[in-house]
């Protein structure tokens, strides 16, 4: 019964899958299945994903496209890349903000919110690592400032000010009486 299977149309292969009656060519990324093919190894009827929807991969059975995600304004997210027919919106943080994951095991799809980056300059410190995937890493005090407690204190401008040992080491002053 029947004939030999055509080598260019193997229903178990990647390019053709049984949809309805026949093995059909899938729809390319960015397209959804409107109707399956009407002959063996035929092309399905595929339509471009409507605005604000996408399908990222070639597919055989998707009869509708996925809705593009909206970036969460409440979490200060912004769209780094707008949604297209073949890719979802890529949400992230605007410059000067970093991603703070809302779960402990953080992956690319994990929920997150955006936090403002530390401004090392405002803290009178060197910037050791710029803020992007995590908060800014601030280094030692800027020239003209010395470590005092948790912060950086400005070197005294005259010999009349007090200058403890750390101050003297950085600012070049000895404590004067």
């Amino acid at each position: 019964q029947g004939g030999t299977r055509s080598p260019r149309c193997d229903c178990a292969g990647d390019f053709h899958k049984k949809i309805g009656l026949f093995c059909c060519r899938g729809c390319p990324a960015g397209h959804y299945l409107k109707a399956p093919c009407t002959e063996p190894c035929g092309n399905s009827t595929c339509l471009v994903c409507p605005q604000d929807t996408f399908l990222a991969w070639e597919n055989h059975h998707n009869s509708e496209c996925a809705r593009c995600q909206a970036c969460d304004e409440q979490a200060s997210q912004v769209a780094l890349e707008n949604c297209s027919a073949v890719a979802d919106t890529r949400c992230g943080c605007k410059p000067g903000w970093f991603v703070e994951c809302q779960v402990s095991q953080c992956v690319s799809s994990s929920p997150f919110y955006c936090q403002p980056c530390l401004d090392c300059g405002a803290l009178h410190r060197h910037t050791r690592l710029l803020c992007s995937r995590r908060d800014t890493d601030c280094g030692t005090c800027l020239p003209g400032f010395y470590e005092h407690g948790d912060g950086c204190v400005s070197c005294p401008t005259s010999t009349l000010g007090s200058c403890p040992e750390r101050c003297a080491a950085v600012c070049g002053w000895r404590q004067m009486f």
Epitope: G3, T38, P40
Partner: antibody, heavy 123, light 111 residues
Amino acid sequence: QMQLVQSGGGLVKPGGSLRLSCAASGFTFSSYAMSWIRQAPGKGLEWVSTISDGDSYSYFPDSVKDRFTISRDNAKNSLYLQMNSLRAEDTAVYYCTRDRIYGSVQYYAMDYWGRGTLVTVSS
Amino acid sequence: DIVMTQSPDSLAVSLGERATINCRASESVEFSGTSLMQWYQQKPGQPPKLLIYAASNVESGVPDRFSGSGSGTDFTLTISSLQAEDVAVYYCQQSRKLPYTFGQGTKLEIK
């Protein structure tokens, strides 16, 4: 014993609706594509619709598309044809068929037919 | 759509003689080395019955006096020795692509 028992035919006015049923027995209904074929009085055979096994995709010629719907209930071993917006030219004997797939070339032939049910569309 | 055209429209053959019915498709119905077409027999007041599938394969239970041949676009149904019970209308049909289409039918009678 393989059987396709049809029901639901009758007289209907133009613009009216009718639902045909086909009860299958004697084979694994869910494993077969099924079709409806019609034959106008004294005329030849015309394909009306097919529904696939498994994923239940449906197919229609342009003459009935958007007016007819085909469905199946595998739990009840039943095939249905819902006919809306009927026209005088839809008058025919409607046959339910089992579609057997042959070999590995996705090739179907209607190997069993019901006895048919007459649909008359007239005012 | 693939148009199936049968010839002749009607045919009268003597009992025991050979009957030949032709069917031509408007385009090839071949796929992967198989002709996707079949022949049906319809006796008066009965539903059609599958006789031949894939152009030349005789369906189970069909008498061996029925045979089919042909490929591509041209096909033939042959009854080698006509019997009284063969009086019927015969239809060819293609399954190469949707919509499935039938020939107009050939009425076979006894001469």
